[in-house]
């Protein structure tokens, strides 16, 4: 059909991955489909299977090398085409010119540590996973509070517009549990997006002393 | 959105060659998946080739594979169809589409504007 529901989308961790989901309306569920990948400037080929995530989407990882390997560069071009099995051989169903500076979402932050908590306040520090040296300190977070009787959609957004890898939460409620969520995104890229949210991180800020407000 | 002009159709007998232009307006053609459809008259308009945006990449209908070539000239925002072994089957209008701007190419087209159309005639 013209205008189909077909959708080929990618992103690269800046570093040796390129993740990729491939839809399509009307498709067998047990349909054998790969991506491959096809760079303009490097001697390497790889190819990821794609496994089902959903009725119509299938997902796949194309490793390119060691997690922290700097496998592409803003210059590179990776050529990245969907085959499916059909009989005995495979068609090529879509395929993709892919900037990889231009598509980056990076992991999500790792290693989400208190490193103080009082009654009103509590600072979290974390790290980033896999992220390019390229960026040097042009990265930005969103944080969010999950709050008792609330969900993490209600929770307000909390923006860190630099490369800054703590937090100091205000005004919190003594003797409450809490838990915290951050992500991270380059400033580089035009179709660049937001990595997963971090694992939450579980504290409890202290309760307040009796007889003062502390 | 890009305005797509084709030019190039024709009278041609069996056996023979045609290579069809379809000239973009528009400063995303450089990053645009183009395609060419046709459509006979009483069928469905169906998919005949897509190039990546680069150029680097290539789909064809399994009835056109080896016969036609799509290719692009992104300084001069054009694409081209070089129609090779002509059939009275290839008889048709012949389409110029253009894709979501950085998107990929599709079999099942995804497209964002259309060209008016060229007419390809094989006569045996």
């Known amino acids: 059909a013209v205008n189909g529901t077909s959708q080929f989308t990618c992103f690269y961790n800046s570093r040796a991955n390129i993740s990729c989901v491939w839809s399509q309306d009307g498709a067998l569920q047990d349909t054998s489909c790969q991506v491959h990948a096809w760079p303009d400037r490097r001697r390497w080929n790889q190819t990821c299977e794609l496994l089902p995530v959903s009725q119509a989407s299938w997902a796949c990882n194309l490793i390119l090398g060691a997690p922290d390997s700097q496998k592409l560069t803003t210059v590179d071009i990776v050529t990245l085409r969907v085959l499916c099995r059909e009989g005995v051989r495979w068609r090529v169903m879509a395929i993709q010119d892919f900037k990889p500076f231009e598509n980056l979402r990076l992991m999500a932050p790792i290693s989400l540590q208190v490193v103080h908590v009082e009654t009103h306040r509590c600072n979290i520090s974390w790290e980033i996973s896999q992220a390019s040296h390229y960026f040097e300190r042009h990265l930005e977070f969103e944080a969010r509070t999950l709050s008792p009787g609330h969900t993490w959609e209600e929770a307000p957004l909390l923006t860190l517009k630099q490369k800054q890898e703590w937090i100091c939460l205000e005004t919190l409620t003594p003797d409450t549990q809490y838990e915290f969520q951050v992500r991270v995104k380059p400033l580089q890229g035009e179709f660049t997006t937001w990595s997963p949210w971090s694992q939450p991180l579980a504290f409890r800020t202290k309760p307040a002393a009796l007889g003062k407000d502390t | 959105e890009v305005q797509l002009v084709e030019s190039g159709g024709g009278l041609v007998q069996a056996g023979g060659s045609l290579r069809l232009s379809c000239a973009a307006s528009g400063s995303t053609f450089s990053r645009q998946p183009m395609y060419w459809f046709r459509q006979a008259p009483g069928k469905e308009r169906e998919f005949v080739a897509a190039?990546?945006?680069?150029?680097?990449?290539?789909l064809y209908a399994d009835s056109v594979e080896g016969r036609f070539t799509i290719s692009r000239d992104n300084a001069k925002n054009t694409v081209y169809l070089q129609m090779n072994s002509l059939r009275p089957d290839d008889t048709a209008a012949y389409y110029c589409?253009?894709?979501?701007?950085?998107?990929?190419?599709?079999?099942?087209?995804?497209?964002?504007?259309w060209g008016q159309g060229t007419q390809v005639t094989v006569s045996s």
């Open positions: 589409a253009a894709g979501p701007y950085g998107d990929a190419a599709y079999r099942h087209g995804r497209i964002d504007s």
């Open positions: 190039i990546t945006w680069s150029g680097r990449g290539t």
